[in-house]
């Protein structure tokens, strides 16, 4: 009886650290689903390594991916999103090193857009607003939201506010008047899905007024 | 060369358990999924379900949920299944069976143990 | 779940000759289909898989096609070595195999 030789067959000399991570962006394009892998230690030789993803596809049981410089990169509509994939790190065919992962569980949602902040006098308050992608998506709709803000002069000292929605009111009381702000925001699945915080949004800058200024967006 | 052996046979009583083994050798254990496959007497094969030995993942024939439970030792390259509250519908020859070498998780099975015959009896 | 209808469930033949076994799947498998020689007393011998790539050291008397939900077997070139019964197995979705068919000598 016959079988064939596959990765049992590799020897000690490869035991580097092939050691990577992932995430999924769901219906990042139209229908199709992204898959994003790279190596946790970047001076990883990735010449001739390969990934590839089994299981959990509809259609297809597996699928080689791209590789974009140092990442490692899919985009299907074939990922069933029920059940954990086979992640492996692949030479001339044989497996290196494998990771099962449920892709619903390592997702990074699209960072925010459309930041922008309006100052209201007669309330004295800022109105934070940005939008989202994901409440256009089927999947991955509901998201906890991170929005950072700090005095530019103050570099490390950014304050957070969690909130599910895409408004936020900042009191003027609580900023320093005549000042300008740094704010951003990102977002993190929050709901049957799990994952990664986004990429910040691009940040945006007011200036807070003195006690008394004229209503009406904040200059960036 | 691949060879995975198996007890030739197994006697046990009604409503006990038994932990059948199969024992790897020539071959790096822990990069090939092990299957364990049923065969009644005179009648087919029938899939139980299918074990990582790297990280002890599982992928199971629900029919057997609950009746047969699937682990490795990788210190000494044996898989082993578990098989509880026996009854005379579990008589059969009980075979392991590597895997062939795709990583995706249902694939064919290249080599194959003589198979362990247990028979439940009072 | 996928079911495999395997027909015939016995057949005779002559050395010498050919005989073709055939496995209806339920569904689509696409082409997620292995072969298997089973001998009273030992563990079944992979023939085929993927429908129609031989395992190392199979002679090429044995062959595979098909597609979709219809494949099929082949022996020609009978010898008495090949007196067994034979399986289908799809893998496209869990693991299930056909009922067998008992090849014996006419």
């Known amino acids: 009886e016959s079988g064939y030789a596959q990765n049992g067959d590799l020897e000690d000399a490869e035991l580097d650290d092939y050691s990577f991570s992932c995430y999924s962006q769901l219906e990042v394009n139209g229908s199709q689903h992204s898959l994003t892998c790279a190596f946790e230690d970047p001076d990883v030789n990735t010449t001739n390594l390969e990934f590839e993803i089994c299981g959990a596809l509809v259609e297809v049981k597996c699928l080689s991916f791209r590789k974009l410089q140092e990442i490692y990169f899919i985009e299907t509509k074939k990922f069933l999103l029920i059940g954990k994939s086979n992640i492996c790190v692949k030479v001339g065919g044989k497996s290196l090193t494998c990771k099962k992962i449920d892709l619903t569980t390592i997702v990074k949602p699209e960072a925010p857009f459309d930041l922008s902040v309006i100052y209201r006098e007669g309330a004295n308050d800022f109105v934070v607003t940005f939008n989202t992608s994901h409440l256009q998506k089927k999947y991955v709709k509901v998201l906890m939201h991170d929005v950072a803000y700090r005095q530019e002069k103050d570099e490390n000292k950014w304050m957070h506010v969690n909130l599910s929605s895409t408004k936020l009111t900042l009191l003027q009381r609580n900023l320093q008047p005549e000042a300008m702000y740094e704010i951003k925001v990102r977002s993190i699945p929050d709901h049957y899905f799990k994952g990664f915080w986004s990429e910040w949004s691009p940040s945006y800058y007011f200036r807070t007024p003195e006690i008394n200024n004229s209503p009406g967006e904040m200059d960036p | 060369q691949v060879q995975l052996q198996q007890p030739g046979a197994e006697l046990v009583m009604p409503g006990a358990s038994v932990k059948l083994s199969c024992k790897a050798s020539?071959?790096?254990?822990?990069?090939?999924?092990m299957h364990w496959v049923k065969q009644r007497p005179g009648e087919g094969l029938e899939w139980i379900g299918e074990?990582?030995?790297?990280?002890?993942?599982?992928n199971d024939n629900q029919k057997f949920k609950g009746k047969a439970t699937l682990t490795v030792d990788k210190s000494s390259s044996t898989a082993y299944m578990q098989l509880s509250s026996l009854t005379s519908e579990d008589s059969a020859v009980y075979y392991c069976?590597?895997?062939?070498?795709?990583?995706?998780?249902?694939?064919?099975?290249?080599?194959w143990g003589q198979g362990t015959s247990v028979t439940v009896s009072s | 779940d996928i079911q495999m209808t395997q027909s015939p469930s016995s057949l005779s033949a002559s050395l010498g000759g050919k005989v073709t076994i055939t496995c209806k799947a339920s569904?689509?498998?696409?082409?997620?289909i292995a072969w298997y020689q089973h001998k009273p007393g030992k563990g079944p011998r992979l023939l085929i898989h993927?429908?129609?790539t031989l395992q190392p050291g199979i002679p090429s008397r044995f062959s595979g096609s098909g597609s979709g939900r219809d494949y099929s077997f082949s022996i020609s070139n009978l010898e008495p070595v090949d007196i067994a019964t034979y399986y289908c197995l799809q893998y496209d979705n869990l693991l299930t195999f056909g009922a067998g068919t008992k090849l014996e000598l006419k």
């Open positions: 569904q689509d498998i696409k082409k997620y």
């Open positions: 069976a590597r895997r062939l070498y795709s990583n995706s998780y249902y694939y064919a099975m290249d080599y």
């Open positions: 020539g071959y790096t254990f822990t990069s090939y999924w």
């Open positions: 074990i990582d030995p790297s990280d002890s993942y599982t």
């Open positions: 993927y429908t129609s």
